[in-house]
Interface confidence: medium
């Protein structure tokens, strides 16, 4: 139990779409501010966002040290203007999150097709190595640098003409697909980690068809 | 429940191949990379190999990868280990196992006993 | 490749004892470290992955930690049924290897 005017926070959320991470909750603040607070199972506690009336906080910061570490984050409350103020323990009150481990959950990212370039019958289309906000000596680190084979892309491609989805795969960032000549198609990509249980795949990116600039045609 | 059954043991003679397969049950068959380890009597586990069974894709342990082919079966959700020109040290239990997603091995087989003795 | 260092191979303890077992990698391998514990004549079983992470079903008592090349596996306390060989693995990068086995018994 806290001070009589001051709320724990709750429905703490993580939302992380490629590693950017941020913990969301409720209530807005009524005459309180939040102190945030993040941590690996075996660490110690470090405070973020410091007495703000916000109800979210970003701990990218955090996460990409090492996102295949569990992290737990708890938001503490305070009344406004008298922040040394605690609970009838001693403590100021809190409320834990869910665990939360970055490698396993965060969400996929819509992909974006880069290119696709048409040579003969054969059409190579590229998908954007999306950059991560994961840090190794000192550069971002791609979307590809950090999951290697436990991503994979998903092609779907149709003619212009026609509404009948083919697909293909691929662990690289590249795909190598036979058209018929003669024929625009258009197509769209989704990033999938198959051996997920959760946030497998991302949506759908943007459609581009043959025709238009991103692509480029040789005989 | 996911199930990875394999074949019954061998022996086979020094300078013979044999083909161990490792049928998978319980679960998206082509999601997770299948994985060979294999184990001396006595001793520890040597990982041998990996396969893709979405694209029959392979990466072997530089040391077998003149004598070890991984090969996969789709319309039966079964991959298979050769090893050639087999020799005495080759004796051991071979075991397949299902790569969880990050890299630990999270299903393992039964084992096959592989006997190389003339 | 990346040599992995277990120690020690083999130990005693009694039944509610703290048990420890260590893994060096000969380079950083970050988190990229698994335990599995395997039981004579049967398969490897996975407990630990992400150096501390316990896997579906495993009890309380298995724990792993460590980072970059220094890791620990500890049984809290330890019972009758955990009489086998463990093992640490690296995930972290091609070829997988593993540690040379800690065999623990009963006193």
């Known amino acids: 139990s806290g001070t009589t005017n001051t709320v724990a926070a709750y429905n703490l959320t993580w939302k992380s779409t490629n590693f950017k991470t941020i913990l969301e909750w409720e209530p807005k603040p009524v005459n309180q501010v939040y102190t945030v607070q993040i941590s690996t199972k075996s660490g110690d506690w470090k405070s973020k966002c410091f007495y703000t009336t916000d109800t979210e906080c970003d701990l990218t910061d955090e996460i990409v040290k090492d996102v295949k570490q569990t992290y737990l984050a708890r938001v503490f409350s305070y009344p406004a203007g008298n922040v040394e103020s605690t609970g009838s323990a001693g403590e100021p009150l809190y409320e834990n999150s869910p665990e939360f481990t970055p490698y396993l959950e965060t969400n996929l990212g819509q992909p974006t097709i880069q290119s696709f370039e048409q040579v003969g019958t054969k059409v190579n289309v590229t998908v954007e190595d999306e950059r991560t906000l994961v840090r190794r000596n000192n550069t971002f680190l791609s979307l590809r640098d950090v999951f290697g084979k436990d991503l994979i892309y998903t092609l779907y491609y149709w003619k212009s003409s026609s509404s009948g989805k083919k697909t293909a795969k691929t662990n690289t960032n590249e795909f190598l697909i036979d058209v018929d000549k003669g024929e625009n198609y258009c197509f769209s990509v989704q990033a999938v980690i198959p051996s997920r249980t959760v946030n497998r795949k991302s949506t759908d990116s943007p459609v581009e068809c043959m025709g238009q600039e991103k692509g480029e045609f040789r005989e | 429940e996911v199930q990875l059954v394999q074949s019954g043991a061998e022996v086979k003679k020094p300078g013979a191949s044999v083909k161990v397969s490792c049928k998978a049950s319980?679960?998206?068959?082509?999601?997770?990379?299948m994985n060979w380890v294999r184990q001396a009597p006595g001793q520890g586990l040597e990982w041998m190999g990996e396969?893709?069974?979405?694209?029959?894709?392979?990466t072997y342990n530089q040391k077998f990868k003149a004598r070890v082919t991984m090969t996969v079966d789709q319309s039966t959700s079964t991959v298979y280990m050769e090893l050639s020109s087999l020799r005495s040290e080759d004796t051991a239990v071979y075991y397949c196992?299902?790569?969880?997603?990050?890299?630990?091995?999270?299903?393992w087989g039964q084992g096959t006993t592989v006997t190389v003795s003339s | 490749s990346i040599q992995m260092t277990q120690s020690p191979s083999s130990l005693s303890a009694s039944v509610g004892d703290r048990v420890t077992i260590t893994c060096k990698a000969s380079?950083?391998?970050?988190?990229?470290i698994a335990w599995y514990q395997q039981k004579p004549g049967k398969s490897p079983k996975l407990l630990i992955y992400f150096a501390s992470n316990r896997y579906t079903g495993v009890p309380s008592r298995f724990s792993g930690s460590g980072y970059g090349t220094d890791f620990t596996f500890t049984i809290s306390s330890l019972q009758p049924e955990d009489i086998a060989t463990y093992y640490c693995q690296q995930d972290y990068s091609s070829p997988w290897t593993f540690g040379g086995g800690t065999k623990v018994e009963i006193k």
């Open positions: 396969i893709n069974p979405s694209t029959g894709g392979s």
């Open positions: 319980g679960y998206s068959f082509t999601g997770y990379y």
């Open positions: 196992a299902r790569r969880e997603l990050g890299g630990p091995f999270g299903y």
């Open positions: 380079q950083s391998v970050s988190q990229g």
